[in-house]
Interface confidence: medium
C-alpha cells in the first residue's frame, strides 16, 4: 500500500483491544481545504515505541487503515480511497508493548465536517441568579455550534456539562457556581446539525472563584503609643490563599481575592472623615484613639463577609496636668502645642458612661502661642463639660484632619466639670472629742475625689472665736479625717473643710461650731 492511501488490507498487528486506561482518545477529523482532510488525536500514556493506525470503515463495510507512525496527526486527500461524501466510521488503533489500544469511534461525513475552534480570546464571566454565565465572541465563520463545558474543583475530577445549541455572533453558557471553592472550566464547540462532526479541542482554562470569597484568617497586633502619639498596626498573619484546581495554579486570572482594610476611628466623632479603606499590605499608623478595623475580602463577584476587630484606645502613661483656667466668661484649656498649623480635636466623655456618648469639638488650625501652648476655650452657655461630674478628656492633633491615618494623640486626662469649686465642697463635716485638748474632724469624700488626679488636697480651717486666730491644715487627698490638737477647753471654735484642685481653690464647707468641755476635778 502507498503511504498516501488508505490500505484495504489487514493491519500489521493482532486485532485485540487491551482495554487499558491509556491509549488514543479525542479523535477529530475534518476538511481543511477543498480536497484535503486531517485527523488528529491525543495519546495518553508512555509514547516510546507506540505506532498509531487510523482505521476507517466505509458504509459498504470495507475497512482500511493509514499508518501514522509515532505522529498523532495525519492528512490525506479525497483521492486516498476514503469516501468523503458518504458517512464513514473512523477510530485510532495504537500498537504498543505487544498490545492494541483503541480510541472511541467517530461517525461522520468528512466533506461536511468543518474544523471548529474552541471559544477563543476573552471569555466574560458573570453571576446570574446564583449561576455562572460565560459569554464569548463566536469564532469567525463558525456561527451555529453545539457547546459543551467541563469543570473541576481542587478536589474533584472533571464533570461534563452541556451549554446547548448556539446560533449567534456571541455564544454563552450557564454553568454551576460553587459557593466556597474555586473551579476550572473549559469549553469546546462543534458544528451544529452536522451529524457526527468532531468536537474542537478544549479552550484554555477559565478560572472562577467561589461565590463567597474566603473569610480572611488574619491576626493583628498594635504597638504601644510612641512619644509622637502614634502607634503602628501590624499584620501578624497573612490571609490564606485560595486552593486552586490544577489548571488554575500559577497564573489564574479571575480567581484573585483582594483583601482591603477598612479603618473606622471611633474617637473624635466630629472630625470630617471617620473611615478609610486601605490595601492590606499597607499597614497604617494610628493615634491612641479607639478604632474598629475590618478586613474585607472580595473577588470578581463582589465583597464577602468581613471580620471586624476592635482596637481599644491607648491611654497615655500618666494623666497630663491639663492647664485649665476658669473665668467669668468661660473656660480655657492649655496644653503643649504639637507644631504649626495643627487642628486639634478635643473629646470629652462623662466617666462611667458609654463610649458612644463622647462629645467633641474641632479647633481651627492654630499655631502655638508665644509660650508654645495650644488652647481651646468655651463659654458656659455652650454647655460643654457643664455638668458637675468627672469627665475623661482626650486631645488629638493633625496637620491634615481630612486624612484618617494622620491623627495623633496629644494627651488624655480627667477633668471635673461645672462649678468644681462649689461641687467639690466636702459635706457631713463632724467633730468628735479626741482628748482633753484635741478633736477628730472627719467629712464625706469630696465629689472631686471620684476623678483621678483632680483633687490635690483637702484644707481644714480652725478658727478660735475668742482670739479670732485661724489655723489651716493641709490633708492628703486620700484622707477624710484629721486630728486638731492644742485646743483650749471652754473656748468656742469653728471648723471648715475645702477641697482644692491644681488650678482652683475650693469653697469652704458650712462652719461647724464646737468646744471642749471644761473638766471639773472631784
Amino acid at each position: 500500500c502507498r503511504t498516501s492511501e488508505c490500505c484495504f488490507q489487514d493491519p500489521p498487528y493482532p486485532d485485540a483491544d487491551s482495554g487499558s486506561a491509556s491509549g488514543p482518545r479525542d479523535l477529530r477529523c475534518y476538511r481543511i481545504s477543498s480536497d484535503r482532510y486531517e485527523c488528529s488525536w491525543q495519546y495518553e500514556g508512555p509514547t516510546a515505541g507506540v505506532s498509531h493506525f487510523l482505521r476507517c470503515c466505509l458504509s459498504s463495510g470495507r475497512c482500511c487503515y493509514f499508518a501514522a507512525g509515532s505522529a498523532t496527526r495525519l492528512q490525506f486527500s479525497d483521492q486516498a480511497g476514503v469516501s468523503v461524501l458518504y458517512t464513514v466510521t473512523l477510530w485510532v488503533e495504537s500498537w504498543a508493548r505487544n498490545q492494541t489500544e483503541k480510541s472511541p469511534e467517530v461517525t461522520l461525513q468528512l466533506y461536511n465536517s468543518v474544523k471548529y475552534e474552541p471559544p477563543l480570546g476573552d471569555i466574560k464571566v458573570s453571576k446570574l441568579a446564583g449561576q455562572l454565565r460565560m459569554e464569548w465572541e463566536t469564532p469567525d465563520n463558525q456561527v451555529g455550534a453545539e457547546v459543551q463545558f467541563r469543570h473541576r474543583t481542587p478536589s474533584s475530577p472533571w464533570k461534563l456539562g452541556d451549554c446547548g445549541p448556539q446560533d449567534d455572533d456571541t455564544e454563552s453558557c450557564l454553568c454551576p457556581l460553587e459557593m466556597n471553592v474555586a473551579q476550572e472550566f473549559q469549553l469546546r464547540r462543534r458544528q451544529l446539525g452536522s451529524q457526527g462532526s468532531s468536537w474542537s479541542k478544549w479552550s484554555s482554562p477559565v478560572c472562577v472563584p467561589p461565590e463567597n470569597p474566603p473569610q480572611p484568617q488574619v491576626r493583628f497586633s498594635v504597638e504601644q503609643l510612641g512619644q509622637d502619639g502614634r502607634r503602628r498596626l501590624t499584620l501578624k498573619e497573612q490571609p490564606t490563599q485560595l486552593e486552586l484546581p490544577e489548571g488554575c495554579q500559577g497564573l489564574a486570572p479571575g480567581t484573585e481575592v483582594t483583601y482591603r482594610l477598612q479603618l473606622h476611628m471611633l474617637s473624635c466623632p466630629c472630625k470630617a472623615k471617620a473611615t478609610r479603606t486601605l490595601h492590606l499590605g499597607k499597614m497604617p499608623y494610628l493615634s491612641g484613639a479607639a478604632y474598629n478595623v475590618a478586613v474585607i475580602s472580595s473577588n470578581q463577584f463582589g465583597p464577602g463577609l468581613n471580620q471586624t476587630w476592635h482596637i481599644p484606645a491607648d491611654t497615655h502613661t500618666e494623666p497630663v496636668a491639663l492647664n485649665i483656667s476658669v473665668g467669668t466668661n468661660g473656660t480655657t484649656m492649655y496644653w503643649p502645642a504639637r507644631a504649626q498649623s495643627m487642628t486639634y480635636c478635643i473629646e470629652w466623655q462623662p466617666v462611667g458612661q458609654d463610649g458612644g456618648l463622647a462629645t467633641c469639638s474641632l479647633t481651627a488650625p492654630q499655631d502655638p502661642d508665644p509660650a508654645g501652648m495650644a488652647t481651646y476655650s468655651w463659654s458656659r452657655e455652650s454647655g460643654a463639660m457643664g455638668q458637675e461630674k468627672c469627665y475623661y478628656i482626650t486631645i488629638f492633633a493633625s496637620a491634615h484632619p481630612e486624612k484618617l491615618t494622620l491623627w495623633s494623640t496629644v494627651l488624655s486626662t480627667y477633668h471635673f466639670g461645672g462649678n468644681a469649686s462649689a461641687a467639690g465642697t466636702p459635706h457631713h463635716v463632724s467633730v468628735k472629742n479626741h482628748s482633753l485638748d484635741s478633736v477628730s474632724v472627719d467629712w464625706a469624700p469630696s465629689l472631686l475625689s471620684t476623678c483621678p488626679g483632680v483633687l490635690k488636697e483637702y484644707v481644714v480651717r480652725c478658727r478660735d472665736e475668742d482670739s479670732k486666730q485661724v489655723s489651716e491644715h493641709p490633708v492628703q487627698p486620700t484622707e477624710t479625717q484629721v486630728t486638731l490638737s492644742g485646743l483650749r477647753a471652754g473656748v468656742a471654735y469653728t471648723v471648715q473643710v475645702r477641697a482644692d484642685t491644681a488650678w482652683l481653690r475650693g469653697v469652704w464647707s458650712q462652719p461647724q461650731r464646737f468646744s471642749i468641755e471644761v473638766q471639773v476635778s472631784d
Partner: nanobody, 113 residues
C-alpha cells in the same frame, strides 16, 4: 463583638477583702485600657480604678491605697484587689473597655456587719 465577664463579688464584713476579675474576649487587638466602675442604688456610676495600655494605673481618692488594679496580658484579664472594705463600697461593680460601649453585666459587692 467584644464581651466582658466579671466574677468574684460577694458579701464581706467591714475591713475584709475581695478580689474581682474581668475577662475580655472577642476580636481585640493590643492591650486595652480597662476600668472598674461601681454603681450603688440610686447613685451614678463612678470610676473605681483604671489601668492603661502601658500598665499605668489611676484611682479616685476615695479608694486610693485600699484598691489595686492589675492585669494579665496573656488573656486580657483585669483584676481588682479590694482591701479594707467599708460599707460605702457596697455596689454593683462593672468592668469596661475604656472609653467604649463595651460593659460587663456586673458583680455585686456587699459590705456589712
Amino acid at each position: 463583638e467584644v464581651q466582658l465577664v466579671e466574677s468574684g463579688g460577694g458579701s464581706v464584713q467591714p475591713g475584709g477583702s475581695l478580689r474581682l476579675s474581668c475577662a475580655a474576649s472577642g476580636l481585640i487587638v493590643g492591650r486595652p485600657a480597662m476600668g472598674w466602675y461601681r454603681q450603688a442604688p440610686g447613685k451614678q456610676r463612678e470610676l473605681v480604678a483604671i489601668i492603661g495600655s502601658g500598665g499605668n494605673t489611676n484611682y479616685p481618692e476615695s479608694v486610693k491605697g485600699r484598691f489595686t488594679i492589675a492585669r494579665e496580658n496573656a488573656n486580657n484579664t483585669v483584676y481588682l484587689q479590694m482591701n479594707s472594705l467599708k460599707p460605702e463600697d457596697t455596689a454593683v461593680y462593672h468592668c469596661n473597655l475604656h472609653g467604649t460601649r463595651f460593659w460587663g453585666q456586673g458583680t455585686q459587692v456587699t459590705v456589712s456587719s
